[in-house]
Each structure stands twice: as structure tokens, then as C-alpha cells.
């Protein structure tokens, strides 16, 4: 019996600068069925457009496919909540696709214990960038972070790998089973989720001595 409360656009993310999705939180429903619509215009334009795809991103979302995504324009968007008693509006959100990229986690994480005869043994970690990211165009610089810990330990040990897709770790506890994960982020944007954990058993004769 009341108009809807204020919705809030709380997150916009792009996996690769080619598409993006925004999500909103509904306000109170006022006790009545409420319809939501997202409208937007591009900076410098006055023509308002409605969300092209309410389905792909799940409930309370708007997905912008390739044909609706342009990298060099700021989107100004707002959610309208309407029930039989009235309409309410979110604050306007300004979105620049360049700054909302959150890639998928890196792929093909491989971990191996290397024990060269003439040098210290080490843990060799290798991975591939996420498939949706095209690094060849030069649009993207991906940075990587690795975390690992003994299976029963509480604390993670974190290593920054920069732009490389392989990394060596020297100091490990012999005889322990380690979990290893990797994640990535673009130069502007958000860290991906951590990749699924890969387990590696460190041999008992793995030595950290010179």
C-alpha cells in the first residue's frame, strides 16, 4: 500500500571491455508487486534507452551485449521501481567500462616441484590468461597474484607475479601438501576470483639448504 523504496545500483562489471552487466538492490516493496526498469544515456547525449537485456545477468540486473558496449563513452544509468502507488528512482550511476573490468580467473594452473641437481629445488607455477581476454590487441595489461598455503594452515602466503604467467617459489616446508591459487586483474579494474585450488605434495627430501 506504499510506493516502492529507493533501489540502488551497487555493482557493474565487465569480463573483457566488450560486454558488461550492472546489478541493483531493490528497496522495500511497499507491500505490493513492483516492476523495475533500468534506463541509461551516454554522456553528451540526451536520448534515454532502456536496458537491452534483463535476463542474462540474473535477477535485478541489466546486461549490455557487444552492440551496446562502447569503451570510450561514459554511461549514466538509473533504476526506476514502480508499483500501483508510485515510482521511485535510484541515484544516477556513472559507468566507464574501462574501470569496471573484472576478468574471469586464470586458467590451466599447473604446479610442479622442480629439483635441479645443481640448484635449489623450487615450486614451479604456470597458468594461462582467461579466454575472454585478448592480450594481443594491447588493450589489456593483466597482473597476476599467487597465493599458497599448507593444507591445514590458516594463513595464505601471497606473491605478486606482475605480468608473467609463470612463477618460482623457493621456500616451502618439506612433506607438506600445499594449496595453490592464482588470480588476475587488469591495470584499471578489479581482481578476478581466485582460480580453483591446485594441490601439490612437497617431497620430504625437499631441502631449503644451499
Amino acid at each position: 500500500q506504499l510506493p516502492p523504496g529507493k533501489p540502488e545500483i551497487f555493482k557493474c562489471r565487465s569480463p573483457n571491455k566488450e560486454t558488461f552487466t550492472c546489478w541493483w538492490r531493490p528497496g522495500t516493496d511497499g507491500g505490493l508487486p513492483t516492476n523495475y526498469s533500468l534506463t541509461y544515456h551516454r554522456e553528451g547525449e540526451t536520448l534515454m534507452h532502456e536496458c537491452p537485456d534483463y535476463i542474462t545477468g540474473g535477477p535485478n540486473s541489466c546486461h549490455f551485449g557487444k552492440q551496446y558496449t562502447s569503451m570510450w563513452r561514459t554511461y549514466i544509468m538509473m533504476v526506476n521501481a514502480t508499483n500501483q502507488m508510485g515510482s521511485s528512482f535510484s541515484d544516477e550511476l556513472y559507468v566507464d567500462v574501462t574501470y569496471i573490468v573484472q576478468p574471469d580467473p586464470p586458467l590451466e594452473l599447473a604446479v610442479e616441484v622442480k629439483q635441479p641437481e645443481d640448484r635449489k629445488p623450487y615450486l614451479w607455477i604456470k597458468w594461462s590468461p582467461p579466454t575472454l581476454i585478448d592480450l594481443k590487441t594491447g588493450w589489456f595489461t593483466l597482473l597476476y597474484e599467487i597465493r599458497l598455503k599448507p593444507e591445514k594452515a590458516a594463513e595464505w602466503e601471497i606473491h605478486f607475479a606482475g605480468q608473467q604467467t609463470e612463477f618460482k617459489i623457493l621456500s616451502l616446508h618439506p612433506g607438506q601438501k600445499y594449496l595453490v591459487q592464482v588470480r588476475c586483474k587488469p591495470d584499471h579494474g578489479y581482481w578476478s576470483a581466485w582460480s580453483p585450488a591446485t594441490f601439490i605434495q612437497i617431497p620430504s627430501d625437499f631441502t631449503m639448504n644451499d
Epitope: 500500500q1 521501481a81 515510482s87 521511485s88
Partner: antibody, heavy 119, light 110 residues
Framework: EVQLLESGGGLVQPGGSLRLSCAAS????????MHWVRQAPGKGLEWVSA????????YYADSVKGRFTISRDNSKNTLYLQMNSLRAEDTAVYYC??????????????WGQGTLVTV | QSVLTQPPSASGTPGQRVTISCSGS????????VNWYQQLPGTAPKLLIY???NRPSGVPDRFSGSKSGTSASLAISGLRSEDEADYYC???????????FGGGTKLTVL
């Protein structure tokens, strides 16, 4: 006949508290949103707060947010306004008004006779 | 400073037609319905028009309401002395998330 009767007004010191009540009769109380509207002496109307029929949804004017709490007891057909941290600018006649039902945006109708709060 | 803007006063002679305006914005009048209230001296307000142009039962058809864009108006035809009162427009504001009133218009029947 639909009736609303406010009570609980009076004189209170700044920083003090007061609880207003509004007894409703002549309609199915739980099917309507309810409102408090106030009018400072010689001034216009100012909406204060609203509550949905089930008491789940509540709204407040920015001027009272965090200080006033609206509630209702549908078993007693009564609307309440708990007013804390009262200020001189809260001095007004406080009206309770019936809002909309489940199907139509009806406006505030009827209004109670009002109760005077002096801070 | 009220969110909805009304002229502070209006006047007319008996039998005349008087119009009171109410100006708002896209988040109130522009996207929601307008209600009008009459407050006779020393009494509680009374609903005069709801949903832009609907009259509750008991309100004479001399009173009519309309809305266009972000403005609304109340027209009173065949003005009578008992119409002397304060008139308020009001409605839901979807940005402020609350109901807003105009400052009120004092109608004097000359």
C-alpha cells in the same frame, strides 16, 4: 463511519520524548497504509512518516529520520509515532491520515482532528 | 522552501472560476499522481482531488484537477464563499522517497 482520533500530544522539553497514538475505526485497518503529517503554527503541511498495512514498510521525512519511529498494532487498530530527541522545530499539530489500500493510490483520506505537540 | 511550488495566494469573486497551479519535477509530479487538499480555517485538511483528477464522493464537481508534465492545477468554478480556505497539492517524490506538499495557496473569495 471512518474515524481517526489522535492523542498523546502535549508540552515537552527539548531533547525529550513523546508518543502519539491514533485510534482508527470504521474500516479494515490492516488493509491501509497510514501516515503522520504535521503543521507548524501558521505554516503549511509537512509529511512526517508512513507505514504499510502489515507494518513492514516504513518511510520517514529526512527532518525526522533517526529520531521518530512509526509503528502500528493491527490487533488494536492503532497507529503510533514515537518521537525522541525533540527539537523546537518539531512544534506542530500532528495529524494521522489514512493512506492507500491494496489497489488504488487514494491520497490521504480521512484525517484525524490533530494533536498539538509543543517543544 | 517546499518541493512543490504553489502561488501563496489567489482570489476571485463569487461565481468566478479560479485556477491554482502546482509546479514540481520529474521525480514527483512528472512520474507520480497529484492529490489536492482543502483546509478550512481551524480544521483538519480534507482530500479534494486524488490521482490527478478524481473526486472523492461528496466533493462537488465544481472542483477539478488536471496534470501535464511536471505541473498540475486545481480549478474551482462557480466560486462560493465557503471555498475560502488553504489549498495544498501533494504527491510521492521518487527521489526523496517520501510524500511532498506544496507550500499552500490561500484562496480569498472577495
Amino acid at each position: 463511519e471512518v474515524q481517526l482520533l489522535e492523542s498523546g500530544g502535549g508540552l515537552v522539553q527539548p531533547g525529550g520524548s513523546l508518543r502519539l497514538s491514533c485510534a482508527a475505526s470504521g474500516f479494515t485497518f490492516s488493509s491501509y497504509g497510514m501516515h503522520w503529517v504535521r503543521q507548524a503554527p501558521g505554516k503549511g503541511l509537512e509529511w512526517v512518516s508512513a507505514i504499510g498495512g502489515r507494518g513492514v514498510s516504513t518511510y520517514y521525512a529526512d527532518s525526522v529520520k533517526g529520531r521518530f519511529t512509526i509503528s502500528r498494532d493491527n490487533s488494536k487498530n492503532t497507529l503510533y509515532l514515537q518521537m525522541n530527541s525533540l527539537r523546537a522545530e518539531d512544534t506542530a499539530v500532528y495529524y494521522c491520515a489514512r493512506g492507500s489500500n491494496w489497489t488504488h493510490a487514494l491520497g490521504f483520506d480521512p484525517w484525524g482532528q490533530g494533536t498539538l505537540v509543543t517543544v | 522552501q517546499s518541493v512543490l511550488t504553489q502561488p501563496p495566494s489567489a482570489s476571485g469573486t463569487p461565481g468566478q472560476r479560479v485556477t491554482i497551479s502546482c509546479s514540481g519535477s520529474s521525480s514527483n509530479i512528472g512520474s507520480n499522481t497529484v492529490n489536492w487538499y482543502q483546509q478550512l480555517p481551524g480544521t483538519a485538511p480534507k482530500l479534494l482531488i486524488y490521482g490527478n483528477s478524481n473526486r472523492p464522493s461528496g466533493v462537488p464537481d465544481r472542483f477539478s484537477g488536471s496534470k501535464s508534465g511536471t505541473s498540475a492545477s486545481l480549478a474551482i468554478s462557480g466560486l462560493r464563499s465557503e471555498d475560502e480556505a488553504d489549498y495544498y497539492c501533494a504527491g510521492w517524490d521518487g527521489r526523496l522517497i517520501g510524500w511532498v506538499f506544496g507550500g499552500g495557496t490561500k484562496l480569498t473569495v472577495l
